[in-house]
Amino acid sequence: FERTRSLQDPCSNCPAGTFCDNNRNQICSPCPPNSFSSAGGQRTCDICRQCKGVFRTRKECSSTSNAECDCTPGFHCLGAGCSMCEQDCKQGQELTKKGCKDCCFGTFNDQKRGICRPWTNCSLDGKSVLVNGTKERDVVCGPSPADLSPGASSVTPPAPAREPGHSPQ
């Protein structure tokens, strides 16, 4: 079968990193400089991606795999395979068409990317606000107001410390 297949399609035995070269009677030639083929049986090699400008090289191109890019400091990747680089903002900001803008009151962003999101509405879960939100942090919801009736504690007391080597009385 192997011999039959070879005679039918001389390109089928070309390994990754080579191409089936029409200029050389369809024998397998190594991929030219700055190109690659990631699978066998290819009739051409693909041009390597070049990481230029705001992109930087994360992985060099080889004869069997494309280069991989990421973004220079101050930018982050967007899209499949880091097809775009987008400017970072500070925590508490979001990127708009006019640049980085502070989050509006009632919203926050705890990352250098993405948009400002509304604070959690604690009352929707029947809870109260334990820690107020900021531009950088969401609110922290605490127990429901009913749990905070006189005599009820919102914090569980720590277990009493035991001396080592003694069993509880």
């Epitope: 990193g17 200029n23 030639s29 190594p30 030219p32 400089p33």
Partner: nanobody
């Protein structure tokens, strides 16, 4: 032009080893890749292994893990170390040099005369 002379072929038993050499002379400064091919009687010429001027190597699936291509720049020689040889490795082994890429094809393509490798008990 580039002249290529292969050596090191012969008769070897299955499981044995051979080292083929390909000595290059002439306009060797412009060589991009050195390639070993093999051709068994009545069959097409098959890619075995290649090494580029940058040292990148490629192997045919059928020889991966058994054959190693290397080069000695000082001697302008490319080697093919062949271990764990099998009867199906029997063929004439040809050395090939490829010049720089012009955007469509390799600028030149020179071949040695070949060296016979026979694997048989």
């Amino acid at each position: 032009a580039v002249q290529l002379v292969e050596s090191g072929g012969g008769l070897v038993q299955p499981g044995g080893s051979l080292r083929l050499s390909c000595a290059a002379s002439g306009s060797i400064f412009s060589i991009y890749a050195m390639v070993w091919y093999r051709q068994a009687p009545g069959k097409q010429r098959d890619f075995v292994a290649s090494i580029t001027s940058g040292g990148s190597t490629i192997y045919a699936d059928s020889v991966k893990g058994r054959f190693t291509i290397s080069r000695d720049n000082a001697k302008n020689t490319t080697y093919l170390q062949m271990n764990s040889l099998k009867p199906e490795d029997t063929a004439v082994y040809h050395c090939n040099s490829l010049g720089s890429w012009d955007g469509e094809r390799y600028e030149y393509d020179y071949w040695g005369q070949g060296t016979q490798v026979t694997v048989s008990s």
